[in-house]
């Protein structure tokens, strides 16, 4: 099928158009013994010369000026459907005095190199050689759309053919499709759809959950404003042109919601005063997690039930809970939030702190000399239960004996029962400095402030005790 097309579709004058759904076979002289050759010009891509005429400076033996060289006019506009084949050519007659003429093909200002089906055929005569350069595409695609020209180089002159415009028509092609979105419930949002031909125009219909949204089509591009959704929906757009319709990908529009609680919580490590936990976040409710909250309460049924709350960033799903009591049981729950709100708290899990070394020293340390038995008696009060940080297994007593020129330190371990001890006098006429620390399986606590007592030489009597005051008694 051939038909003339009006010129204004493309810039520049050209003799006519061919609309075809088959390979156009142009009538060519078929000289016997033609020489097909693949010829590609080494010329660099560049703007073609305006016009298609060159007047060579070379003259014949008789110095007769040669006629101007020009490509013959050919079809100017070919319209065809995608995947069809097309063949077009340009021809020129060149006086035989010119050697090594090459024809190159250019598309939209760029030379076509490589694996294109370009064949140049030569038909020599007495004075001139007819050269026909054919270009064929077996299955056209949209990317083949454009303006094709031939270029010939003779004696550093460039001869340029008229353009041949190839217009590949097909189903609408999407240049912009709707995108998946996560939106707030009952909040308006926009979706965009854009498709192109040729052929134009392209009309757009919107589809929501398999039902058309607009009864009348909109010209591409189209923006759909959705006033708001209460539940998830799938949107797509249909693009129609004279060749048929193309449907975009379906995109899911999700409604943002509060997240689900974490699916796992792990107790990574426990110390006397801290617990390291990690968690696996639940479903994010289509909105990124912002932060998480760790709720901690004492598991002891007799506790007052108050909840400690520790806020942390959503990443890295890890938190060290600090300032906890030693050797205590805790219930822990984790909750995370996004822009919509907080998740429910995870199921409560149990975790325990370990035993620690006591955090305070024994109180009211008193030291006095029992001269009759040549002993030093020591008395104290055990640290407050809350600060024992475990089960007391005993005490460590440090006593340092200092007299002129000598100093020696001794350590004693005593059992947890009672709060007194007796140590033998090591040196007379010396100062004894006593310090006591409480001991649990978690370690040795801090030593008490030093208490000094003077041990006189034999025969002196001094029963006055030395002591450290209990807190608040000073």
């Amino acid at each position: 099928r051939e038909e003339a097309k009006p010129y204004p579709l493309f810039p520049g004058p050209f003799p006519g158009s061919l609309q075809t759904d088959h390979t156009p076979l142009l009538s060519l002289p078929h000289a016997s013994g033609y020489q097909p050759a693949l010829m590609f010009s080494p010329t660099q891509p560049g703007r073609p010369h305006t016009g298609n005429v060159a007047i060579p400076q070379v003259t014949s033996v008789e110095s007769k000026p040669l006629p101007p060289l020009a490509f013959k006019h050919t079809v100017g506009h070919i319209i065809l459907s995608e995947h069809k084949g097309v063949k077009f050519n340009c021809s020129i007659s060149v006086p035989n005095i010119y050697q090594d003429t090459t024809i190159s093909w250019w598309k939209d200002g760029k030379e076509l190199l490589g694996a294109h089906h370009a064949i140049t055929q030569f038909y020599p005569d007495d004075e001139v050689t007819a050269i026909i350069a054919s270009f064929s595409i077996t299955s056209v695609q949209r990317s083949d759309n454009g303006s094709y020209i031939c270029k010939m180089k003779i004696n550093n002159e460039e001869i340029v053919s008229d353009p041949i415009y190839i217009e590949v028509q097909g189903l609408p092609h999407f240049t912009k499709q709707p995108e998946s979105m996560n939106v707030t419930r009952n909040t308006a949002f926009n979706l965009t759809c854009q498709a192109v031909g040729p052929p134009e125009p392209v009309n757009i219909f919107w589809v929501q959950n398999s039902s058309r949204v607009n009864e009348q089509p909109e010209k591409s591009p189209s923006v759909l404003t959705v006033p708001g959704l209460t539940e998830m929906a799938v949107f797509s757009c249909e693009a129609h042109n004279d060749k048929g319709l193309t449907v975009s990908k379906g995109v899911q529009i999700n409604i943002k919601a509060i997240p689900s609680p974490p699916t796992e919580v792990s107790i990574r490590n426990s110390t006397a005063h801290s617990i390291l936990i990690s968690w696996v976040p639940g479903f994010d409710g289509y909105s990124p997690f912002r932060n998480c909250s760790i709720q901690v309460k004492e598991a002891d049924p007799l506790s007052n039930g108050s909840v400690m709350i520790f806020n942390t960033s959503a990443l890295p799903h890890l938190y060290q809970i600090k300032q906890l009591q030693a050797l205590a049981n805790y219930s822990i729950g984790v909750s995370c939030m996004n822009e919509i709100g907080w998740s429910a708290v995870s199921p409560w899990i149990l975790a325990s702190t370990t035993e620690g070394a006591p955090s305070v020293a024994p109180l009211n340390v008193t030291v006095f000399l029992n001269e009759s038995s040549d002993n030093v008696d020591i008395r104290w009060m055990k640290p407050p239960t809350k600060q024992q940080d475990g089960e007391l297994v005993g005490y460590r007593i440090s006593h340092v004996w200092q007299s002129a020129g000598i100093s020696k330190e001794l350590l004693e371990e005593v059992g947890q029962n009672g709060s007194r001890a007796r140590i033998s006098v090591q040196v007379h006429n010396a100062t004894c400095t006593v310090r006591i620390a409480a001991v649990t399986r978690g370690g040795v606590g801090p030593f008490s402030d030093p208490v000094k007592i003077f041990i006189p030489a034999h025969g002196w009597v001094d029963y006055a005790p030395s002591s450290t005051p209990a807190p608040g008694n000073a």
Partner: antibody, heavy 128, light 111 residues
Amino acid sequence: EQQLVESGGGLIQPGGSLRLSCAVSGFSLSSNAMSWVRQAPGKGLEWIGIISSSGSTYSASWAKGRFTISKDSSKNTMYLQMNSLRAEDTAVYFCARVGFFVGYGAYDYGIIHRLDLWGQGTLVTVSS
Amino acid sequence: DAQLTQSPSTLSASVGDRVTITCQSSKSIYNNNWLSWYQQKPGKAPKLLIYDASDLASGVPSRFSGSGSGTEFTLTISSLQPDDFATYYCAGGYSGDSDYAFGGGTKVEIK
């Protein structure tokens, strides 16, 4: 839609091995612990083991050594490798999603809170 | 290993009846409440009914309720419906142990 589909069951001779698969859709194995449970014909449910989101596994004492749980998160599939099969292993094998799980890494154990989504099961018959 | 014992093992009842199933644990359940109830119909997979001893799973009718703590738990169906004839299992976990124990099951059948 969230779904679990077991496969790989069938007739197997005593002493043989079999690998069951549990294909997960609608949620990710990297965010949820998963479990295997079996049910002998006419009997009750029996827990086999669990694989946490990070890949740690815990098994019932009777299953240790013969049954191994693994997963391929890229395929969103969990597996149960069963070796040295016996007639008493004949059962329907279910995979189930663990709704919540607490792990005690330092002590190498973990506790299931609930199994909130189950597959339809696959029958394994061990017989000569 | 800890054990969960359900009673009765079989229960005959009529539509509209109030039904109670008990589940006793040989030691305290983790956190005293990490006990779940499952419903299973012949040839089908179990379905979660109740977790945390008393919380209803999503989509479960309100005629189902659970109670209990520590070692004693109860599942109650306030008014038995035709769709409720099935086998019910309790299950739970324990501190210091990965095992997830199931009760022996209670079959609720039509009287």
